[in-house]
Interface confidence: medium
């Protein structure tokens, strides 16, 4: 059946060091555990975290990310995921993608990353 | 079955506090995040506080904002507002609300609880 | 704030009628739009989620439309149980946001 995918309408933001959730959803919500799931960075594909078979596939990411991802699927169940970045890095900001694949059929969504700088003040003087 | 249950609604005198609970069964409650919505006698609803499935991030109107804490003890599966600084405009039903997503990304509810008066008078 | 404006603010119907309420917003909201019921003393009910996903367990005669500012709830044919209020609720950006409500009456 089709659907379509709901990633945040706004940036994400996030402190250098610390963790970003990027959400993602499928509506109507339906189980996607047995779906394609992931996430890649725009423009230039290249995977930041891939989910198939019931299973994340380590080995498909891109070096920069490998360890620092976890997908959460609590409610995949209802078509709900959210990626979860480890120790953001100023190199993290920008544009990613998520998809969702169902056989033949895939939809994505696009969604903005803001890394800030925890230690960044401006003198008031 | 998702269930939710506010507890904690009374009479109230102006500049005094409450503080509400919302006991969640039937889902992960620690998965999802929670909302309260208000509303007055014979009024419209009204968004009231969000706070995501972890308890880090918060929003509130900014009708109340100052005055009203939202809060949640995942370990006991509740969902708590504080009241304080009650004034005669605070008088609704409170309704807990189960947020469709875990964090807060746009918030809508697919499950209410039945809800608790909260009167505010002198 | 974005300001959610239903119309019309109530309506007389008749059972098997085709009703239509529509909710327009201060400005754009995408598809960010839910559909609530609500019936006397009752906590609201979620209808349709994202502008136009039933939710589940909700009966398909009921259907959402629209995308960016105007959106519509149909009810194809109205049944005894679906005399009650209905609500739009924007979720694009904080603080969301409620229409004022629909009370739809017996004719």
């Known amino acids: 059946g089709q659907f379509r995918v709901i990633g945040p309408g706004y940036p994400i933001r996030a402190l250098v060091g610390d963790e970003a959730e990027l959400p993602c959803r499928i509506s109507p919500g339906k189980n996607a555990t047995g779906m394609e799931v992931g996430w890649y960075r725009s423009p230039f594909s290249r995977v930041v975290h891939l989910y198939r078979n019931g299973k994340d596939q380590d080995a498909e990411q891109a070096p920069e990310y490998r360890g620092r991802t976890e997908l959460l699927k609590e409610t995949i169940s209802e078509g709900k995921v959210t990626l979860r970045i480890q120790n953001v890095r100023f190199s993290d900001e920008g544009g990613y993608t998520c998809f969702f694949r169902d056989h033949s059929y895939q939809e994505e969504a696009a969604m903005e990353l803001k890394v800030e700088d925890p230690f960044y003040w401006v003198n008031p003087g | 079955e998702v269930q939710l249950v506010e507890t904690g609604g009374g009479l109230v005198q102006p500049g005094g506090s409450l503080r509400l609970s919302c006991a969640a069964s039937g889902f992960t409650f620690s998965s999802y995040a929670m909302s309260w919505v208000r509303q007055a006698p014979g009024k419209g609803l009204e968004w009231v506080s969000d706070i995501n499935h972890s308890g880090g991030s918060t929003y509130y109107a900014d009708s109340v904002k100052g005055r009203f804490t939202i809060s949640r003890d995942n370990s006991k599966h509740t969902l708590y507002l504080q009241m304080n600084s009650l004034r005669a405009e605070d008088t609704a039903v409170y309704y807990c609300?189960?947020?469709?997503?875990?964090?807060?990304?746009?918030?809508?509810?697919?499950?209410w609880g039945q809800g608790t008066l909260v009167t505010v008078s002198s | 704030d974005i300001v959610m404006t239903q119309s019309p603010s109530s309506l007389s119907a008749s059972v098997g009628d085709r009703v239509t309420i529509t909710c327009r917003a201060s400005?754009?909201?995408?598809?960010?739009l839910a559909w609530y019921q609500q019936k006397p003393g009752k906590a609201p009910k979620l209808l349709i989620y994202?502008?136009?996903s039933l939710e589940s367990g909700v009966p398909s005669r009921f259907s959402g439309s629209g995308s960016g500012t105007d959106f519509t709830l149909t009810i194809s044919s109205l049944q005894p149980e679906d005399f009650a209020t209905y609500y739009c609720?924007?979720?694009?950006?904080?603080?969301?946001?409620f229409g004022q409500g629909t009370k739809v009456e017996i004719k």
């Open positions: 609720q924007q979720f694009n950006s904080y603080p969301w946001t």
């Open positions: 609300a189960k947020d469709y997503y875990d964090i807060l990304t746009g918030s809508f509810f697919d499950y």
């Open positions: 400005q754009g909201i995408s598809s960010a």
């Open positions: 994202d502008a136009s």
